[in-house]
Interface confidence: low
């Protein structure tokens, strides 16, 4: 055996010295395909003459008389050397164009060559092979292709990557899926399906390295193909918007003198679009800054928001302006596949201030007066003044924001509370200001789990109206797992506000929940019968923090308080 | 991004010479077969020549052989197509393209193109 | 050198019509034929390769077929965007050679 290995050996070195004196057509080292494959995995790698370098397949060549000759050079070493197809169970072997590691071995790293030729004709191409190991948790240094997924957009899918051709369509291989170390299954969004899997809903929380397990037998032995994708949630096409400059605006004018520096941001949002080029320029005068000449710096910052929305910001800067410069027209472009904009900077000369000591004076006196009256007006009448303004020019804000509900409200479940919450607080919210309030032991269908209906509502709700008293406390009440889920929506998304009322004093309290609520919360106080006062500050307290809503019965409670019928029966 | 960009077209007389430039980004110029196209005002595609990645080997149209000679500074990043003794019927618009697949004959990418006017 | 013949040479179609341009080799090219489409004053585009490959990024209503002499690109249902002229290119030998172009017009 080793004497025909030596044999075989001298025969290829022959080729390679006849090829040298002959000419051979290489086509170098295809660094463009880096492959890399796993130790103690199968590998099949393609000779890429065929794929990229010449117009005629493998068969056409074969059938032609060309003979396709394979052989290495290890790692570090400049001998090229024959690939000894003679190991034990065939790891190597060839097929027709492929070249066949079953499985591979660490020490297989190399550049590998694979030449056609025959007696007149020689073309050859030599491609890097790197066998890399992986831990336990698929963790390598291999390069991971990156799979995008839009956000909120249906169901979308992935493909376990590269398994094409590992084995013929009658075997069925058992195809396991892992999000970075842990197997998937019984996720919510994410379900596997064979060589695919499946995102019901791609959200932030599924960006990550996904791998496929691919398992298969052949020859009484099982083999194992791992495949690792990175996946990245991006901005979804439905909410691409054309590129929005937010500087230069109207609302800035750039004031200079001559000499001073002219510094102007042209900030630019654009949404992620797949394939997208997003450009940002500026023209001065309509010209290209380069195709004047002012001396002009343009330097440009790039950031990416977690769905790959861009922000460029590129500042203009011309070191000492003059007066010629501050009347040119500079003009912000921005363009994406979605559609182009562009932005004038308001740049003005700075006129001299004139001198005007006593007038100056008393200016001043007036304006500070003005301030201190406005100050103490503001502290005595601030509620009227923010629900005035609120009632005026606030913004719905619950227009399109997903919720159901206004208010989720938490209470003890006694006859005391429980009055205070149907009666009071609910006549007045629902009926009198137009707010939508759940209330669990209402609006709950009967037979559904508690802790996920309460979850639910809390989700779908805007404000989180704790009503506080003694009876709120006590350790493991329906109250407190609603006190904890709010808390914990506010503080890790935001998307919920916690409301503290307090219905009778509570005194010193072990539930952490509550202290740390207490500390960072404003709390109402109910002050009983001098509460249900119409203009009382506790219904005005409690409708600044409410959500503000446009509603058709809000009409003149915002400016009067309350009218007095909506409590006469409380 | 893959671009290609041609200037160096213009106005110039019968039996004058010009030299296009074509300059390339966003990919490894010395890996593709580069190749001038030209289109007659109003008329189809021609194509005029290519030049392998090492610039060993040219081809060209029958009807610019001797004249138009074809090269490349994979360096620089650039193709060149130096036009001498031209005439009226070689008034087009030039364009670079970039061979698929290292030298496949396809063309995967194109330049803006840049007019060629021979005209007395 | 070989010739290209395409027909027609201008096609009037409407929008979702299936349409499907012809083009002819002079002698036989096995599959060593692409197919690009060209909007006026632009550079054309690479629509098909090696007969019936598609370009990557080309929309899937586009496809081609033939081999030896016989080729034909087919759109499945017109787009506002498709109506362009469309050129055959044969690679099999130098010169590389164009089809004489088909213009594809609204009805």
């Known amino acids: 055996m080793t004497l025909l290995w030596c044999v075989v050996s001298l025969y290829f070195y022959g080729i390679l010295q006849s090829d040298a004196s002959e000419r051979c057509d290489d086509w170098g080292l295809d660094t463009m395909r880096q492959i890399q494959v796993f130790e103690d995995e199968p590998a099949r790698i393609k000779c890429p003459l065929f794929e990229h370098f010449l117009k005629f397949n493998y068969s056409t060549a074969h059938s032609a008389g060309l003979t396709l000759i394979w052989y290495w050079t290890r790692q570090d070493r400049d001998l090229e050397e024959p690939i000894n197809f003679r190991l034990p169970e065939n790891r190597i072997s060839k097929e027709k164009d492929v070249l066949w590691f079953r499985p591979t071995l660490l020490n297989d790293t190399g550049n590998y060559t694979c030449m056609l030729r025959n007696t007149t004709y020689c073309s050859k191409v030599a491609f890097p092979l790197e066998v890399v190991q992986k831990d336990s948790c698929f963790n390598s240094p291999m390069k991971l292709p990156v799979h995008k997924l839009y956000i909120e957009y249906g169901i979308q899918r992935i493909t376990c990557p590269n398994v094409d051709g590992y084995f013929p369509s009658s075997v069925k291989p058992t195809i396991t899926w892992y999000m970075g170390c842990y197997k998937i299954q019984n996720f919510n969004n994410v379900i596997p399906e064979g060589m695919n899997l499946s995102f019901l809903i791609a959200l932030i929380s599924n960006n990550g390295n996904y791998t496929c397990v691919v398992t298969y037998p052949e020859n009484g032995r099982t083999f194992h193909l791992t495949r690792t994708l990175t996946v990245k949630v991006v901005g979804s096409p439905k909410n691409a918007v054309p590129p929005v400059i937010h500087s230069p605006n109207d609302h800035v004018v750039y004031e200079k003198e001559p000499g001073e520096e002219l510094l102007i941001p042209c900030t630019v949002y654009f949404s992620f679009l797949m394939d997208s080029r997003n450009e940002v320029w500026w023209t001065i005068d309509g010209k290209k800054p380069d195709d004047i000449t002012i001396d002009v710096t343009i330097n440009e910052s790039i950031s990416h928001s977690r769905t790959e929305d861009e922000t460029r910001t590129q500042i203009l800067s011309i070191k000492k302006v003059t007066s010629e410069d501050l009347k040119r027209s500079y003009v912000c472009h921005a363009r994406s596949a979605k559609g182009e904009v562009a932005k004038a900077a308001k740049v003005k000369q700075k006129v001299p201030a004139p001198r005007y000591t006593v007038e100056l004076a008393c200016g001043f006196g007036a304006t500070v007066l003005l301030v201190v009256i406005l100050i103490v007006v503001y502290h005595v009448y601030w509620l009227e003044m923010v629900l005035f303004y609120r009632a005026h020019f606030g913004t719905d804000e619950t227009i399109l924001d997903g919720k159901e509900y206004d208010i989720y409200v938490s209470y003890a479940r006694n006859a005391e509370e429980e009055e205070f919450v149907l009666l009071t607080l609910r006549g007045v919210l629902e009926n009198e200001f137009g707010y939508k309030l759940c209330i669990f032991d209402r609006d709950s269908l009967p037979g559904g789990i508690v802790t996920d209906e309460t979850l639910s509502f809390i989700q779908k709700s805007r404000r989180l109206l704790v009503v506080l008293s003694p009876n709120y406390v006590l350790q493991g009440t329906q109250a407190l797992l609603e006190l904890k889920a709010g808390l914990e929506n506010m503080a890790s998304r935001g998307n919920i506000n916690v409301i503290l009322v307090q219905y009778k004093a509570v005194k010193e309290t072990k539930v952490k929940e509550l202290k740390r609520a207490k500390t960072v919360l404003t709390v109402i106080k109910w002050k009983g019968e001098k509460s249900k006062y119409p203009q009382g500050r506790f219904w005005k307290q409690l409708q600044v923090a409410m959500p503000v809503k446009k509603s058709p019965r809000r009409s003149s409670s915002d400016e009067q308080g309350l009218s007095y019928s909506s409590l006469k029966n409380v | 991004e893959v671009q290609l960009v041609e200037s160096g077209g213009g106005l110039v007389q019968p039996g004058g010479s010009l030299r296009l430039s074509c300059a390339a980004s966003?990919?490894?110029?010395?890996?593709?077969?580069m190749t001038w196209v030209r289109q007659a005002p109003g008329k189809g595609l021609e194509w005029v020549a290519n030049i392998k990645q090492d610039g060993n080997e040219k081809n060209f149209v029958d009807s610019v052989k001797g004249r138009f000679t074809i090269s490349r500074d994979n360096a620089k990043k650039s193709v060149f197509l130096q036009m001498n003794s031209l005439r009226a019927e070689d008034t087009a618009v030039y364009y670079c393209a970039r061979e698929g697949y290292f030298g496949s004959g396809y063309f995967d990418y194109w330049g803006q193109g840049t007019l060629v006017t021979v005209s007395s | 050198d070989i010739q290209m013949t395409q027909s027609p040479s201008t096609l009037s179609a409407s929008v979702g019509d299936r349409v499907t341009i012809t083009c002819r080799a002079s002698q036989s090219i096995n599959s060593w034929l692409a197919w690009y489409q060209q909007k006026p004053g632009k550079a054309p585009k690479l629509l098909i390769y090696?007969?019936?490959s598609l370009e990557s990024g080309v929309p899937s209503r586009f496809s081609g077929s033939g081999s030896g002499t016989e080729f034909t690109l087919t759109i499945s249902s017109l787009q506002p965007d498709d109506f362009a002229t469309y050129y055959c290119?044969?690679?099999?030998?130098?010169?590389?050679?164009f089809g004489q172009g088909t213009k594809l017009e609204i009805k």
């Open positions: 290119q044969q690679y099999n030998s130098y010169p590389h050679t």
């Open positions: 966003g990919f490894t110029l010395s890996f593709y077969w």
């Open positions: 090696k007969a019936s």
